[in-house]
């Protein structure tokens, strides 16, 4: 997992300065709110309700 | 280093009531969601209970299995997890683990304690 | 509820050979882009160990002998070559909605 300004996250993550960690993106399906889900690539799937 | 310590637990008759306690470090703790998943012989791994964020007022799921008799809680000043049990049950005998998950996966488990219902 | 149905429920593996562990779900758990599959590794007296995510994602610190593939319903974990050290019970858990579910493990063993 990388800091910000040196090499990006994986493929299918992104940075999360709220938890200081690469996030996957795969978990804004749950919480899209999450402030690395905006830095994912495609925007999340529809709303998800559990 | 993420660690989750468990108290409470051990032998208490049918109808009866425990309080489980975790209390977690290592991690931004209020920004995770906290469950409860037990363990037994018959019903393998179990979840039972989840509690979310204060952002969004401590929302809880429970499984039906429990739900009516346990009730899970937070202080997130004290980096800590409850379950209260009530009414408990001999089907309710097994390992209790609190573990956390962020939105999906349980990544980090306590190191389980036993409860056993009966008379 | 999304039923997972975990196979074999044991299974015997030579030193250095692949072990194969299937994991099936009752509904579909993956979107276009992700499934909502995970694995666990469990040793006696100790509580899960994470090891995959999202189906094929190995957390860090997990060896690359331990790999997860499949989308859909249908998912299986890989360990090859498999070591002593992996005598443990294996489990998958899904995501997909609540309640999240575990499988009814497989037992791997040496032989």
């Known amino acids: 997992e990388q800091a910000p300004g040196t090499a990006p996250c994986s493929r299918g993550s992104s940075w999360s300065a709220d938890l200081d960690k690469c996030m996957d993106c795969a978990a804004c399906r749950a919480r899209p709110h999450s402030d690395f889900c905006l830095g994912c690539a495609a925007a999340p799937p529809a709303p998800f309700r559990l | 280093e993420v660690k989750l310590q468990q108290s409470g637990g051990g032998l208490v008759q049918p109808g009866g009531s425990m309080k489980l306690s975790c209390v977690a470090s290592?991690?931004?703790?209020?920004?995770?969601?906290m469950n409860w998943v037990r363990q037994s012989p018959e019903q393998g791994l179990e979840w039972i209970a989840e509690?979310?964020?204060?952002?969004?007022?401590?929302?809880?799921h429970y499984a039906e299995s429990v739900k009516g008799r346990f009730t899970i809680s937070r202080d997130d000043s004290k980096n800590s997890v409850y379950l209260q049990m009530n009414n408990l049950r001999p089907e309710d005998t097994g390992i209790y683990y609190c573990?956390?998950?962020?939105?999906?996966?349980?990544?980090?488990w306590g190191q389980g304690t036993t409860l056993t219902v009966s008379s | 509820d999304t039923v997972l149905t975990q196979s074999p429920a044991s299974l015997v593996v030579s030193l250095g050979q692949r072990a194969t562990i299937s994991c099936r779900a009752s509904?579909?758990?993956?979107?276009?882009?992700?499934?909502?599959i995970h694995w666990y590794q469990q040793k006696p007296g100790q509580p899960p160990k994470f090891l995959i995510k999202y189906a094929s994602n190995r957390d860090s610190g997990v060896p690359a002998r331990f790999s997860g593939s499949g989308s859909g319903t249908d998912f299986t974990l890989n360990i090859h070559p498999v070591e002593e050290d992996d005598t443990a019970i294996y489990y998958c858990?899904?995501?997909?909605?609540?309640?999240?579910?575990f499988g009814a493990g497989t037992k791997l063993e040496l032989q």
């Open positions: 290592g991690f931004t703790f209020s920004y995770y969601w």
């Open positions: 858990q899904h995501s997909w909605e609540i309640p999240p579910t």
């Open positions: 509690i979310r964020l204060q952002s969004n007022d401590y929302p809880t």
């Open positions: 509904q579909s758990v993956s979107t276009s882009d992700y499934s909502y």
């Open positions: 573990a956390c998950r962020y939105a999906d996966y349980f990544d980090h």
